[in-house]
């Protein structure tokens, strides 16, 4: 087992979290994808794309919007009007079923705090790009907490963008607990998805 790096991001209530999940490989373009929150030992799926996932077709579930861009291998996740109770650990996954999802990146530890009311916003800080680069080696990583550049006096409508550029993605197989995850290769995952797809077809024919 290995510990995945967690990244901690702190925002004020009312802000929008925007995450770009980079799935890179064409074989995942039409795979169903999900945005999930870890609650105890089991992830809670908050929003899923359609199955198969449609290109540039926003799916909205409450305050969450998912949009899959096949041509660039990016899934955009937006969580608007963040609330204190949204705080927690989130992941972008290729969704199979609740007990078997494939994490695209290291989890995001989101901390939402009460904002100070009536504080004027700084326009140059209202939108911010925070890049997270996934590890490219299958070695154990201790938890690492990185706060984005401080958003001082950010207005409620400000957007924080979290992006994850990476040369090679590490895909992980979520078992029971977020901190105990087995790193698997793209090739292993590809074979797993193919075999599951075959099983799915056999069950329906």
């Amino acid at each position: 087992t290995t510990e995945l790096t967690e990244e901690k991001y702190e925002y004020k209530e009312g802000q929008t979290l925007e995450v770009k999940c980079d799935y890179t490989l064409e074989k995942f373009a039409s795979s169903q994808k999900a945005w999930q929150k870890m609650e105890g030992k089991m992830p809670k799926i908050l929003a899923k794309t359609e199955r198969p996932s449609k290109n540039s077709h926003p799916v909205q579930v409450g305050r969450i919007t998912l949009e899959d861009y096949h041509d660039h291998g990016l899934l955009q996740v937006q969580m608007t009007n963040l609330q204190v109770e949204d705080s927690g650990l989130y992941q972008c996954v290729i969704y199979q079923h609740p007990k078997e999802s494939h994490v695209l990146f290291n989890p995001i530890c989101l901390v939402v705090t009460k904002g100070s009311s009536g504080t004027p916003g700084s326009s140059e800080n209202s939108t911010q790009n925070v890049y997270r680069t996934p590890s490219t080696t299958a070695k154990a990583l201790g938890p690492r907490y990185t706060s984005p550049r401080t958003v001082t006096q950010a207005p409620p409508e400000s957007t924080v963008v979290v992006s994850t550029p990476g040369s090679e993605i590490n895909l992980t197989n979520v078992t029971d607990i977020i901190r105990e995850q087995k790193l698997i290769s793209e090739e292993d995952l590809e074979q797993k998805l193919i075999s599951e797809e075959d099983l799915h077809h056999h069950h329906h024919h």
């Epitope: 770009k20 980079d22 890179t24 490989l25 064409e26 074989k27 373009a29 039409s30 861009y69 096949h70 041509d71 660039h72 291998g73 990016l74 955009q76 790009n129 890049y131 963008v161 992006s163 550029p165 040369s167 090679e168 993605i169 793209e186 090739e187 590809e190």
Partner: antibody, heavy 121, light 111 residues
Framework: EVQLVESGGGLVQPGGSLKLSCAAS????????MHWVRQASGKGLEWVGR??????????YYAASVKGRFTISRDDSKNTAYLQMNSLKTEDTAVYYC????????????WGQGTLVTVSS | DIVLTQSPDSLAVSLGERATINCRAS??????????LHWYQQKPGQPPKLLIY???NLESGVPDRFSGSGSGTDFTLTISSLQAEDVAVYYC?????????FGQGTKLEIK
């Protein structure tokens, strides 16, 4: 270890045809788009085209300079990509490199050593 | 097609000094917050070697004296302290749109 080996280069007359091969190993070939890039002697790099994967219906894209004359194909069972070059011109003389990207619209992390194509009468 | 223009065409820098190469795109090569712009190094008789991907990410195994920056249409490759082995031709390349395109190259030499 990822390896790309080009073959099939040689001397051909203007108007002639040639088929280049790129044998791949060390990775799951069917997973990645494959590209061809060429370089005339003493000149810069020119992207020739790419072929995507089965999940993208093996879609192909080409540079304007070769469109209609060159065809890229692949055989996933043989881990090989091909560049069929027809109606060759003297300006097609170059070293042809096979490259593998890192995924959708990603960078070229792996290159072959290249094969020389000379178009001359 | 997106045209990439590198400057200068050639550059002579003393050992240990900083070398800077620019790449300007005729239109943005960004999608969302990603710049699909990459840098390669090519030495005589060898295929190109990836140095920087997506504008600013250092490829594994590449010395950290190499760095990339920029977004949209303007990008820079910097070598903080030139070494003898850095003599080569450097190319930028965009993959944001088909057809993919390369810059014309910048030849880097020792002064």
């Amino acid at each position: 270890e990822v390896q790309l080996v080009e073959s099939g280069g040689g001397l051909v007359q203007p108007g002639g045809s040639l088929k280049l091969s790129c044998a791949a190993s060390g990775f799951t070939f069917s997973t990645y788009a494959m590209h061809w890039v060429r370089q005339a002697s003493g000149k810069g790099l020119e992207w020739v085209g790419r072929i995507r994967t089965k999940s993208s219906n093996y879609a192909t894209y080409y540079a304007a300079s070769v469109k209609g004359r060159f065809t890229i194909s692949r055989d996933d069972s043989k881990n090989t990509a091909y560049l069929q070059m027809n109606s060759l011109k003297t300006e097609d003389t170059a070293v042809y490199y096979c490259t593998r990207d890192m995924g959708i619209r990603r960078q070229f992390a792996y290159w072959g050593q290249g094969t020389l194509v000379t178009v001359s009468s | 097609d997106i045209v990439l223009t590198q400057s200068p065409d050639s550059l002579a820098v003393s050992l240990g000094e900083r070398a800077t190469i620019n790449c300007r795109a005729s239109e943005s090569v960004d999608t969302f917050d990603y710049s699909f712009l990459h840098w390669y190094q090519q030495k005589p008789g060898q295929p190109p070697k990836l140095l920087i991907y997506r504008a600013s990410n250092l490829e594994s195994g590449v010395p950290d004296r190499f760095s990339g920056s920029g977004s949209g249409t303007d990008f820079t490759l910097t070598i903080s302290s030139l070494q003898a082995e850095d003599v080569a031709v450097y190319y930028c390349q965009q993959s944001n749109e088909d057809p993919y395109t390369f810059g014309q190259g910048t030849k880097l030499e020792i002064k």
